[in-house]
Interface confidence: medium
């Protein structure tokens, strides 16, 4: 397996470096974070991507003026966006 | 406190079989991949084979040098990964540990080990 | 199959030295690799994972470095209780381990 790779980036653009994963992981994980007040005011936006062993969580969460949303895939550099 | 522990080993004539089990405990074995390495006296570390879980169907995954004759399984109501070996060979005369990775803390190696068990494969 | 070429086979160094062990794979496996630390009769230790991570409980003076295929472990200030076997492996494709370095006391 081989998935995008970054970390606390702002931009997809920063997040196009693949990486090989081990042969412990089944999944390429993004991670998309961000702050704001409905979609009026927004305080920052963070985009994470990894190789992972398991799907952290299956859908968004939201807690209070934060978001963040997580989600997963299996084949071949597959979490591009 | 995470335990491995291997039985089942001794000795066995050439083209003999023998099954090796590992208890584990201190985590939560159906979550994680199960493996086996094993150790010719005075040798280095050779991978034996691996099992993942449920989700992915029990995949497994064999070292060329034992693929076709050994075989792993696991019982995850008991805790235990099983190496079935089968058409043994002097070769295959080593001190075989189970090996669990440790997913906790983001950690997939082989973070956990028994204290292994020896086979010895001689007429 | 990946193969995981480690060099030195053996060293001896005294209390104190910088200790450096590399280790060399066939094709490129990313970041995977990780340490291990074997004392006789022992099953072996994690010491690093995914090339340059220090595993719980791991003094700081083990370190290790790089990518791709070349990949360099090191203990800064050597100690007595360091004596024992060292292992590369990686995980990128099955898992392949290096020979070993047994690292002795001068």
């Known amino acids: 397996l081989m998935c995008f790779s970054c970390l606390n980036q702002k931009s997809n653009l920063y997040c196009l470096k693949p990486t090989i994963c081990s042969d412990q992981d089944n999944y390429c994980v993004t991670v998309s974070a961000s702050a704001g007040i409905g979609n009026l005011v927004t305080f920052g936006h963070s985009l994470s991507k990894t190789c992972s062993p398991a799907c952290p969580i299956p859908e968004g969460v939201n807690v209070g003026v934060a978001s963040m949303g997580i989600s997963c895939c299996q084949s071949f550099l597959c979490n591009f966006s | 406190e995470v335990q491995l522990v291997e039985s089942g080993g001794g000795l066995v004539q050439p083209g003999g079989s023998l099954k090796l089990s590992c208890a584990a405990s201190?985590?939560?074995?159906?979550?994680?991949?199960m493996h086996w390495v094993r150790q010719a006296s005075g040798k280095g570390l050779e991978w034996v084979g691996r099992?993942?879980?449920?989700?992915?169907?029990?995949?497994?995954y064999y070292a060329d040098s034992v693929k076709g004759r050994f075989t792993i399984s696991r019982d995850d109501s008991k805790s235990t990964v099983y190496l079935q070996m089968n058409s043994l060979k002097t070769e295959d005369t080593a001190v075989y540990y189970c090996?669990?990775?440790?997913?906790?803390?983001?950690?997939?190696?082989?973070?956990?080990w028994g204290q292994g068990t020896l086979v010895t494969v001689s007429s | 199959d990946i193969q995981m070429t480690q060099s030195p086979s053996s060293l001896s160094a005294s209390v104190g030295d910088r200790v450096t062990i590399t280790c060399k794979a066939s094709?490129?496996?990313?970041?995977?690799v990780d340490w291990y630390q074997q004392k006789p009769g022992k099953a072996p230790k994690l010491l690093i994972y995914?090339?340059?991570n220090r595993y719980t409980g791991v003094p700081s003076r083990f370190s290790g470095s790089g990518s791709g295929t070349d990949f360099t472990f090191t203990i800064s200030s050597l100690q007595p209780e360091d004596i024992a076997t060292y292992y590369c492996?990686?995980?990128?494709?099955?898992?392949?381990f290096g020979q070993g370095t047994k690292v002795e006391i001068k």
């Open positions: 201190g985590f939560t074995f159906s979550t994680v991949a």
């Open positions: 492996m990686q995980s990128s494709t099955k898992y392949t």
């Open positions: 995914k090339a340059s």
């Open positions: 090996s669990a990775p440790n997913y906790y803390d983001g950690t997939y190696s082989f973070a956990y």
């Open positions: 094709q490129n496996v990313g970041s995977n």
């Open positions: 099992i993942r879980t449920k989700p992915v169907n029990y995949e497994t």
